[in-house]
Every structure is written in C-alpha cells, then in structure tokens.
C-alpha cells in the first residue's frame, strides 16, 4: 500500500499556501484528485510529488495515491481543505444525472471543516427542499440525496453559515431520470372500424410513458398523418393522444392505420383496419354443416357467426317443425361478441328428444334487412326389431320389421336349439337381405324397413333370428316355432304366442 506524506488524513491550509503531497510505493505510483489549477506533478521512480505554491479554494478535495502494479489495488488518501473566508464551497460539478432511486451526490466540498455544523442544502432562491427529501452531508464529498425521485430534479445550492450569514455555493442542477422499462405503452381505438360512405369516424391513437421524452404518430397506409397532439399527465404517466376525426368518410379513407410510439428504449406499434362500405350489410354463416345428425339423447350446439354493420336491431332462434310448435327456450340461446362487427350466436340443445328433430332457423335484422340461416337436425336411432309369422300367397313367411336411423341393414340367422340369441356355434344358416323393403322414410323420422324370409317348413327345434344394425347400434328378435304354435323371442323379453 502506498504511503502519503504528510501522514495525516486531513490537511487544512489558507489560500496562497504552498502544499506538497508526496506519495511513496513499492513500484510506480499515480495521483488522482479533483480537477483544479496550479498543481505541479513530479515523479521519480517509486515516488510522486504533487505540489502547488498558490493553493486556492478550488484545490479543496480528496487526493488519492494508487500503485497500478499492486495486485491488491491498495491506495492511500489525504483530504485537503483550503479555507477561504469568502469561498466556503468548492463545487466539482454543476450538473448531476442519476436514475430514480439512486443516491445523488451533489459535489459541493466544504473548504473549512469548522463550518460543518452550519451547513444546509437548499433549492435556488433559498427555498427549502421538497418534502420527504432524505439527505446526508460529508465535508469531503458534499450532500447526498438518498433514493432520488424524479420530482427532485431541481437546482440546489449548498449553504454554509459564516459569521452569522448564509453563504451559498454556485448552483448544482440535479437531473433525476425515470427508469424507463421499455417503449411507450400504446392504444389504438377502435381495433377495427367499419363505416358506410358518408358517415363520420374517429380513430384515437394514444401513447403513455413514465418519461415525457417520447414521440407518437399515426400513419395511414404508411403515410404519416399531421394531427394535433394532446398531452396530459395522470397516474404518474405522461400521455400523448392523437385523434383523427373524419366527418364524412370515403373509400380513400379505408385501409390500414398504425399508431407508432418511440423512446430511447425502442419502438412500439399497433395497427387497425378501417373498412368503408357502400351500404349496410348482414352476413350469416356457420362453421358447422347445416345438415346435422345426432344420436337421440345426446346434445348439440348450433352456432351461427354474424358479420354486420350497422349493429343488429334484432335476432332470434325459431323451431320450424315438423314435430311440434315448441320454441327453443331463451335460456338455451347464447350470444357472444367476438369484436364490434362479428358476433357468435349459439343454441344449446341438450339431451335431444325425438320431438326435437327438425329445422332450426336463426334470424337476424339490421338496417340492411333480414337474414336467416336454417339448420336441419335429424336424430339417429338404434334399430328396433320385431318378427311375426304369417302366410303370404299361401307360403309361410317370417316377416321382420326394423325401424331406426340411419336405415338399418337386415340379417337373418337360423340356429339349432331354442335361444334368445343365436351364437356362432349354433348358427346353421345366415341370409343377408341387401335390399329390405322401405316401408316409411320421412324427413326427420325413423326409417322403417321390412324383410321377408320364406320358410316352407318350420323346424321345431330351431330358432330364427332377425338382426338389424346401423351406425348407432343393433337390435334383434328371435322366433322359436313350437308344436303348439310359433313363439317369438324379443331379446330378454317374455315368450308370447301371436
């Protein structure tokens, strides 16, 4: 560690005095101190001499000697006071810049340590400090404003009591800069705009930041618009607002509008699209197929997308039949607005009953007129099967009726023994009926088909089974001939004699 001579922490001299500061180290040494006049530097190997033969108040400050070659980076310091009765302060800098919440050192150095008891910090014109200003004083360094705030950006003077009167330093301007987290925050309202030619429109671009130094502009299709700017300050943020007012829009006003704001941290931009139309419009669409098939007992949501300008004046869901005159419950209808001009309307149909199949229409109205979108809802049913023994044209015939939706396929099985359902091991014969006769096929109803199996002689120790299936499920009916007559077995049901 270097050594300074004189070996005292502080040295007090009068103006005009000769001061010699000598530093000795193991290797070469360097002096560092406040920039001030009249010093002469003389270096000789491992020692360096700093001297003046005419000390002034401006030489007041801390002089530090370092040994650049020392790996431990040791240093020695001495503080010099040049006590000038007319100049109690040596100001090292007239402008101090810090960020908010940093400590701000106002470098007014006291030229006479005796004056320390009577020092104070004031604002220019002798005004007291702002409320909640937390500061401390060091005669070697000056006043420190702790955790400086933006509003403490002021001009300050250091005051010392000399002979009963206050003597001020020259001013020190403190600039406390806001810590800017990023580019200004932006809003562009509306996010989308549609107007009929001749109508009025307004687009508002606003930007805000904790710091006043930022720019904002509005551009239309890459052309910067000249709009007067309104400025405001609230919630500790500066706000700049650009409002574009169009009294009568035309097609040339349409297009992309961008709100752009920038500061030292960068740039933010947000865009919107302005559409100018000739007249009112109302478009209905659905992402779903308009023809819907759902299994009975399940639920369905019908969704309609509406694009409209001007806004809707009315809308509703209507059941058009054919089964009943019931109407959808209002509580099952739901409307959500995606944005200003697009809406989604949903009709919830939970646990569908047979009587709820049919046509559902969504109707909407705006100044452009009425529009409707109709869904056709068909219910799917698993097949229901029944078999009877009859004579047709003198021949014994098993008649199987199957009812369901979609149209069921029919298969006949003949198996040994009496059983409710033929299993693989018992099957003697299988007949597929590729074209059963369609007995009824009305929209939104079940399809009923009939299949005939001509049997010359009924084998008494056998079972005849009619099976029907579709995409929903399957059904079957077992027919067991017995000596007393023919018996039929619906699955898991009682025997009966036709």
């Amino acid at each position: 560690i270097p050594v300074i001579e004189p070996s005292v922490p502080e040295l007090v001299v009068k103006p005009g005095a000769t001061v010699t500061l000598r530093c000795v180290g193991n290797g070469s040494v360097e002096w560092d101190g406040p920039p001030s006049p009249h010093w002469t530097l003389y270096s000789d190997g491992s020692s360096s001499i700093l001297s003046t033969n005419n000390a002034t108040f401006q030489n007041t400050g801390t002089y530090r000697c370092t040994e650049p070659g020392d790996p431990l980076g040791g240093s020695a310091a001495i503080h010099l006071y040049v006590k000038d009765p007319a100049r109690p302060w040596n100001v090292l800098a007239q402008e101090v810049v810090v960020f908010e919440d940093q400590d701000a050192l106002l470098p007014c150095l006291l030229t006479d340590p005796v004056l320390e008891a009577g020092v104070s910090l004031v604002r220019v014109r002798g005004r007291p400090l702002m409320r909640h200003t937390n500061y401390s004083f060091s005669p070697w360094h000056g006043f420190t404003i702790h955790r400086a705030k933006f509003i403490q950006s002021q001009d300050y003077q250091c005051s010392a009591l000399m002979g009963g009167r206050k003597v001020m330093s020259i001013s020190i301007r403190l600039k406390v800069q806001k810590v800017i987290p990023g580019p200004p925050a932006l809003t562009l309202v509306p996010a989308e705009l549609v107007r009929i030619r001749g109508e009025a429109a307004q687009i508002v671009c606003s930007a805000s930041s904790v710091d006043v130094n930022f720019d904002v502009f509005l551009q239309h299709n890459n052309t910067k618009l000249a709009i007067p700017q309104q400025s405001d300050f609230h919630n500790n943020r500066y706000q700049k607002v650009l409002t574009l007012n169009l009294d009568q829009v035309d097609f040339q006003h349409a297009g992309n509008y961008s709100c752009v704001a920038s500061n030292v941290q960068g740039k933010h931009s947000t865009s919107m699209f302005f559409r100018v139309v000739e007249s009112a419009y109302l478009n209905l669409s659905s992402e779903q197929n308009l023809i819907q098939e759902v299994t009975v007992g399940e639920g369905l949501n019908l969704k309609v997308m509406v694009e409209a300008y001007p806004g809707l004046q009315g809308f509703n869901w209507t059941y058009l039949g054919p089964f009943s005159d019931h109407q959808p419950e209002p509580k099952l209808a739901n409307a959500t607005t995606k944005d200003t001009y697009r809406h989604t309307f949903t009709l919830s149909l939970p646990r569908l009953k047979p009587s709820e199949a049919g046509r559902y229409s969504f109707l909407a109205r705006n100044p452009g007129g009425w529009r409707a979108l109709t869904f056709e809802l068909t219910l799917r049913y698993p097949p229901e099967v029944s078999v009877i023994w009859t004579f047709i044209n003198g021949s014994g015939t098993l008649l199987c009726a199957a009812s369901g939706y979609p149209q069921p396929n029919v298969t006949w099985l003949q198996c040994s023994g009496h059983t409710d359902r033929c299993d693989e091991a018992q099957v003697l014969q299988v007949w597929d009926d590729p074209y059963p006769e369609v007995l009824s096929q009305e929209p939104f109803h079940k399809v009923t088909v009939q299949s005939l199996l001509t049997v010359e002689t009924l084998e008494h120790n056998q079972t005849y089974e009619c099976r029907a299936h579709n995409s929903v499920g399957s059904g079957s009916w077992a027919f067991i001939p017995i000596s007393a007559g023919a018996h039929t077995h619906p699955p898991d049901e009682f025997l009966f004699t036709p």
Partner: antibody, heavy 117, light 111 residues
Framework: EVQLVESGGGLVQPGGSLRLSCAAS????????MHWVRQATGKGLEWVSG???????YYPGSVKGRFNISRENAKNSLYLQMNSLRAGDTAVYYC???????????WGQGTLVTVSS | EIVLTQSPGTLSLSPGERATLSCRAS??????????LAWYQQKPGQAPRLLIY???STATGIPDRFSGSGSGTDFTLTISRLEPEDFAVYYC?????????FGQGTRLEIK
Amino acid sequence: EVQLVESGGGLVQPGGSLRLSCAASGFTFSSYDMHWVRQATGKGLEWVSGIGTAGDTYYPGSVKGRFNISRENAKNSLYLQMNSLRAGDTAVYYCAREGSWYGFDYWGQGTLVTVSS
Amino acid sequence: EIVLTQSPGTLSLSPGERATLSCRASQSVSSGYLAYLAWYQQKPGQAPRLLIYGASSTATGIPDRFSGSGSGTDFTLTISRLEPEDFAVYYCQQYGSSPITFGQGTRLEIK
C-alpha cells in the same frame, strides 16, 4: 393537459379583502412551486407571491403583511388572501406554475380585481 | 432586489425582419454556468407565454425562430425572421433570487 383556472376576482372597496382561487389540473400539483403574478391595465408584470412544495411562502415588499398565499394539495388548489386592499392593487391576477428550472411554464387566464370606492 | 431593464421600449419592424431584444440585470442572475433568466411573450387579452428559460433553452412548443443568449447581467432574445403573430409585448424575468422580478417589457410592433 395542464390547466390553471383563476376565480374570485371582483370589485372591492379600499381597505377591503378578497380571496382568489386557482384550480389546477393535468399535473401533480403538490410537486410544483406555485405563484401569483399581477398586471395593472397597460402596465407590466409584477410578481405578487410564491409558495413552495413544503408550504414555504415568499412575497415582495409591496404586499408583505397584507397578502397571504396558501395551497391545498388535496384539492389541487392555490389561494391568495388579499387584505387591506389599495387602489394600486387593481390588476388582473394570474396564477402560474414554476417548472423545476424553467421559470413560469404554465399560466392561468387571469381574474380581474378592482379596488375602488 | 435585482432590477431588470429592457431595451428598446418599443421596436418597430416588418414581417420577415430579425428582432433583437435586450435585458440587463442590476446584478448577476447566473450561478456558475446556470442562468436564471426567462423570456415571455404576451398578446393583448392573453396570459404571458414562456418562450425561453435558463437564458437559452427554448420552451416546449415554441418555434425555433426564437432563441436566447447571454449570461451574468446581459441577455438577448432574438427572433430570426418575424412572423405576423410575433408582434406582441416581450418580458424578461429573473428567478434566481428572491424577490422574482420582471423587466418593464418591450413592445414589438409592425412597422
């Protein structure tokens, strides 16, 4: 947008009193020193009083002891209580905000005080 | 108190010309390199408007034809090229020591 709106002016007899108000908006009122400046018809500007953020008050010799400046930060309001009014106090009174180191950066539109018998 | 003296009392110029207004202080209104002098413009029936602060800094929204200079006791307001709307009364003000004082004003009129 910074706005200062004065009110309370009017006709008053010599020796009478009047209280002027200044409503501030668009900035953090409590963070700024505020002032009153007056201007007699056809004359120049004259600083009348000032108040700091800490409530410290300042007056020129011409009004000291007669005028009292005050502020109510919660209401964003500045006041000037004028007592023992004289004919020489007749003027338009302006409320002004002092920037950090900018001088008086915003002014109100003024309120007329007439002292006459 | 610091007395500010403006000159000339009245200045008659034509649009497009250069205007130079002077303000002299009875004692220094500077502190180091910081000067506490402002210039204001006032039109009939209106409040004063800040043009220049700190002797040479232009206030927000003021056209760059307005400029200020000077330090210590001598200060100048220059309008590089007069526009019709610039004809008004101009005041200097010192705000570095109490009481704050204004100059008596310079009337800038159309020739």
